[in-house]
């Protein structure tokens, strides 16, 4: 079995956690894509999910994580923004292949989100400018219940931070002036 | 411990063409994204190319699109740069880095290699 | 294309001071910010990632702040191996990953 890694990102309060998730895109491309936690002793608890078949660049939000699967490129771009000390915990990005198991893609991340955000003054972690226009329909995926038990055993041990995630939508303000997708070449 | 090392520069006329390998060891190379950054002498950094891990993606920076070619083999942990159509500015120090924690940044690099384009 | 300006290009500090190198970014690019030393010679080293997290075995005395377009790496009391070249990358707007000019620290 291949050995479960995972490396160490820390961010302060009301930052944004930014990460790529890469898949083979001949297997993967319109597969259905999802962000899950790991809590101690749990299966993985899945937190946002595209579109089944995924849709290629269109941003799917789930209170405050955004996803984003960009067929073209292999990569499936995660971000939670408003970062709260409690979101605290193991994440990773599986693919959806029923009636197999998740595939997970590889590596898990810890996210440490620490007090005091390092905003200087004025400044202003929403403002952008040249951003992607999330239509005000934006999509909420239904996302499959199933998590492999194999998993589970795998589970690493439990955070600093017991982590909190919201089942129900989150009101996020200003989310178009969040998104903005990369300028793939 | 993580290692990357590069190899493959030297002199070269312009037009000229030179392959750069970069060995790496230490983490499962196959995982992760890979970058080559440059430095012309004296000067600052300018990123070059990156190849993404699982899905093999490229990506170049404008001065060099066309004319260089990214490319890995994770059978022998090796990350290559084929430059192709050299000019004087792209002499530099190139360096390979290590992706950080899926983002595009780098937490390891190699010493660098350098290439000079010269006639 | 997110532009990285940094200033000033030189700053020349006594050991033991505190010195503030600035980056301002074209357009906001959140805190997807690094700073990485380099010293003649050697390839970068990460310092600082989400423009205030210092990476792995980094002192204390540096520090790093902003988000949006306005960043500070700061170091609180310039030691001799210090001294060297910083350069701030934004990795929000990718590709491609830009890299400012530099500051060069050196000895007052």
């Known amino acids: 079995a291949t050995k479960l890694t995972e490396e160490k990102y820390e961010l302060k309060e009301g930052q944004t956690l930014d990460v790529k998730c890469d898949y083979t895109l001949e297997k993967f491309a319109s597969s259905q894509k999802a962000w899950q936690i790991i809590r101690d002793g749990e299966m993985p608890k899945t937190l946002a999910c595209t579109e089944r078949p995924s849709k290629n660049s269109h941003p799917v939000q789930v209170g405050r994580i955004i996803l984003e699967d960009y067929h073209d490129h292999g990569l499936l771009r995660v971000r939670m923004v408003n970062l709260q000390v409690e979101d605290s915990g193991l994440y990773q990005c599986v693919i959806y292949q029923p009636p197999k198991e998740p595939h997970m893609l590889f590596d898990r991340i810890r996210l440490v989100v620490t007090k005091g955000f390092s905003g200087t003054p004025g400044s202003n972690e929403n403002s952008t400018q040249n951003v992607y226009k999330i239509p005000p329909t934006t999509t909420k995926a239904l996302c499959p219940l199933y998590t492999s038990p194999r998993t589970v055993t795998q589970a690493p041990p439990k955070s600093t931070a017991d982590v909190s995630t919201p089942d129900s939508e989150i009101n996020l303000t200003n989310v178009t002036d969040i998104i903005r997708v990369p300028v793939f070449n | 411990e993580v290692q990357l090392l590069e190899s493959g520069g030297g002199m070269v006329q312009p037009g000229g063409s030179l392959r750069l390998s970069c060995a790496v060891s230490?983490?499962?190379?196959?995982?992760?994204?890979m970058s080559w950054v440059r430095q012309a002498p004296g000067k600052g950094l300018e990123w070059v190319s990156e190849?993404?891990?699982?899905?093999?993606?490229?990506y170049y920076a404008d001065s060099v699109k066309g004319r260089f070619t990214i490319s890995r083999d994770n059978s022998k942990n090796t990350l290559y740069l084929q430059m192709n159509s050299l000019r004087v500015e792209d002499t530099a120090i190139y360096y390979c880095?290590?992706?950080?924690?899926?983002?595009?940044?780098?937490?390891?690099w190699g010493q660098g290699t350098l290439v000079t384009v010269s006639s | 294309e997110i532009v990285m300006t940094q200033s000033p290009a030189t700053l020349s500090v006594s050991p033991g001071e505190r010195a503030t190198l600035s980056c301002r970014a074209s357009q906001s690019v959140n805190s997807n910010l690094a700073w990485y030393q380099q010293k003649p010679g050697q390839a970068p080293r990460l310092l600082i990632y989400g423009a205030s997290t210092r990476a792995t075995g980094i002192p204390a005395r540096f520090s790093g702040s902003g988000s949006g377009t306005e960043f500070t790496l700061t170091i609180s009391s310039l030691q001799s191996e210090d001294f060297a070249v910083y350069y701030c990358q934004q990795f929000y707007n990718w590709p491609p990953n830009t890299f400012g000019q530099g500051t060069k620290v050196e000895i007052k």
């Open positions: 190849m993404r891990g699982s899905s093999g993606s490229t």
């Open positions: 230490g983490f499962t190379f196959s995982r992760y994204a």
């Open positions: 880095a290590k992706e950080f924690s899926s983002n595009s940044l780098f937490d390891y």
